[in-house]
Amino acid sequence: AQGKEVVLLDFAAAGGELGWLTHPYGKGWDLMQNIMNDMPIYMYSVCNVMSGDQDNWLRTNWVYRGEAERIFIELKFTVRDCNSFPGGASSCKETFNLYYAESDLDYGTNFQKRLFTKIDTIAPDEITVSSDFEARHVKLNVEERSVGPLTRKGFYLAFQDIGACVALLSVRVYYKKCPELLQSLARFPETIAGSDAPSLATVAGTCVDHAVVPPGGEEPRMHCAVDGEWLVPIGQCLCQAGYEKVEDACQACSPGFFKFEVSESPCLECPEHTLPSPEGATSCECEEGFFRAPQDPMSMPCTRPPSAPHYLTAVGMGAKVELRWTPPQDSGGREDIVYSVTCEQCWPESGECGPCESSVRYSEPPHGLTRTSVTVSDLEPHMNYTFTVEARNGVSGLVTSRSFRTASVSINQTEPPKVRLEGRSTTSLSVSWSIPPPQQSRVWKYEVTYRKKGDSNSYNVRRTEGFSVTLDDLAPDTTYLVQVQALTQEGQGAGSKVHEFQTLSPEGSGSLAV
């Protein structure tokens, strides 16, 4: 921001009324009036160019310093070209000297040169040559000097003429202030510019109404330079929740809008499924039946729990069931849907039911499922199972009601045994199998059926209560098809896969475990 100038002395604006002191009295400097642009203008002028040894002084009135530390002196003046006088005026000069003196009181007409300190020699950039003078073209020069730090109550300026033809049209003395400033929602007070060029006065700012320093942020500060300019802004203020920045102020959010945190962002319109907010709202309440999860941003619409999974099927495969379902028709407005599968088993004879989570196995953990299918295995034969698939989202925990669909399935067969070849020889095959432990109590015997590959007319059957059997009297180097099936009180269980096992050839050495 531009510096503010506080004027202490303005000769041009005073209309010749200041009555400055001239020394020696009645010689040298003289107050004159002229006409420029049809307006009267006053000037202090001297033009003793034909006589040598000029020492003419013009002293201002005493100027009260006030709060100024460094003053700026702006001079507007004209100097005639020494060559514009007949014979060149050998003693003529084209410069004058600027002085100042500090004092705590006004000395009146008591003028003492020795009290004055020279500021500078003032030289014109442009001199008024004969043709300019004749044509009334005033070649106005502007020079500025500064003095500081000042410490006394007031000061004088003085102008020493040493034989020039000069007119002072304007003498303006001022000091600079950094003006009151609103920046980054912080108010900085009007501050007097310091006196030393390298130094910058640090000024603390105050947040405007309804603005605060953001958490972890720096307090607003600016630096007031010597020239009255604000520099190096540090920190900032931001509008508090419920308020937004409008130009240099924080304005309450309009009804139907909200802002939930200290930030630079504007107020946002209340999202879907919220009630109309009042002025200055920090949030928008959800409509009845709609909710906001703790982690949901305030800008997100309010949502509700999903409806039940749309379509659920349970396909039995022996002692396994594959559950498949489709997503809910109403997601509740959310994308974080997960599914939970629970299992209940009932004994047909007694009608007694109970949870079966501990006795079954799921293809993946049954809670927090994101996919829409799961396989349940280790089911007991001749048991009724009911599976419940519940759809949940981020706000389901905020209501007591649940959204689920159920499917029931009856398991009539044991799971097919898993068969392994334990060993073989030229005339025998040793076979073992296994079924899930929960089903083993239901098995009465295991039936092993085998036949030569390619012979569809005859087969052999062996029954056993154990989990292995050795099939002997077999032909060497021959492939046999082997299947194992559990027998229960209610009938046959599911048969295993048909396995192909081959006996060893006569050249083979002894039995070989596989």
Epitope: D30, M32, Q33, N34, I35, P40, M43, S45, V46, C47, N48, V49, M50, T78, V79, R80, S84, F85, P86, T128, S130, S131, F133, E134, A135, R136, V138, C165, V166, A167
Partner: antibody, heavy 128, light 107 residues
């Protein structure tokens, strides 16, 4: 020595025209502002017109504006006053006058000039 | 236009007298004032410019003073050659105006 010599005056009828000349010598004519000043018989002095050192600007008294024209020829060191539509009240001795700002020991010139050097004058009589 | 009024319009004085002629401007003219001397049948001669500055070759018995609207020409010790008509002229405005003149006669 500075010398200004006017000529061209005489008797002229109202509405008539006359051209006055002023021959300058003894100074650098092209440095001087030149003017015409008149004096009616038994009356005081009245400024008529002025011209700058190089031919401009020119100024006129309200009483002659639009009728009189001032001009100069620096190569001939001569000043002129062309007078048209002459009236009885234009009857006067017409003086040629000059001003050299170099002799004016002042930092800023006044808006107008005073007259350092004068000719002896030429009489213009407007009568029927 | 700025009007210039001289007083008196005529005066009688003896050789050696101190004579003062005044000139009043209708508005402030600072020190932009000149004084001329004119003898019958002759051209005017410049005496004083810028209210108080003596023109080259003018005797020092002539002096001028004043500023603003009130000005005076003083002849300290009137000489026989000084009996003439004296005119003031303002050059603060482009219409350079003269006073009506003051005639100094022998008593």
């Amino acid at each position: 020595e500075v010398q200004l010599l006017e000529s061209g005056g005489g008797l002229v009828q109202p509405g008539g025209s006359l051209r006055l000349s002023c021959a300058a010598s003894g100074f650098t004519f092209s440095h001087y502002m030149m003017a015409w000043v008149r004096q009616a018989p038994g009356k005081g002095l009245e400024w008529v017109s002025r011209i700058g050192p190089s031919g401009g600007p020119t100024h006129y008294a309200d009483s002659v504006k639009g009728r009189f024209t001032i001009s100069r020829d620096n190569s001939k060191n001569t000043l002129y006053l062309q007078m048209n539509s002459l009236r009885a009240e234009d009857t006067a001795v017409y003086y040629c006058a000059g001003y050299d700002s170099g002799y004016d020991y002042v930092a800023v010139a006044g808006p107008a000039e005073y007259f350092q050097h004068w000719g002896q004058g030429t009489l213009v009589t407007v009568s029927s | 236009d700025i009007q210039m009024t001289q007083s008196p319009s005529s005066l009688s004085a003896s050789v050696g007298d101190r004579v003062t002629i005044t000139c009043r401007a209708s508005q402030s003219i600072s020190t932009w004032l000149a004084w001329y001397q004119q003898k019958p049948g002759k051209a005017p001669k410049l005496l004083i410019y810028k209210a108080s500055n003596l023109h080259t070759g003018v005797p020092s018995r002539f002096s001028g003073s004043g500023s603003g609207t009130e000005f005076s020409l003083t002849i300290s010790g009137l000489q026989p050659d000084d009996f003439a008509t004296y005119y003031c002229q303002q050059y603060n405005a482009y219409s350079r105006t003269f006073g009506q003149g003051t005639k100094v006669e022998i008593k």
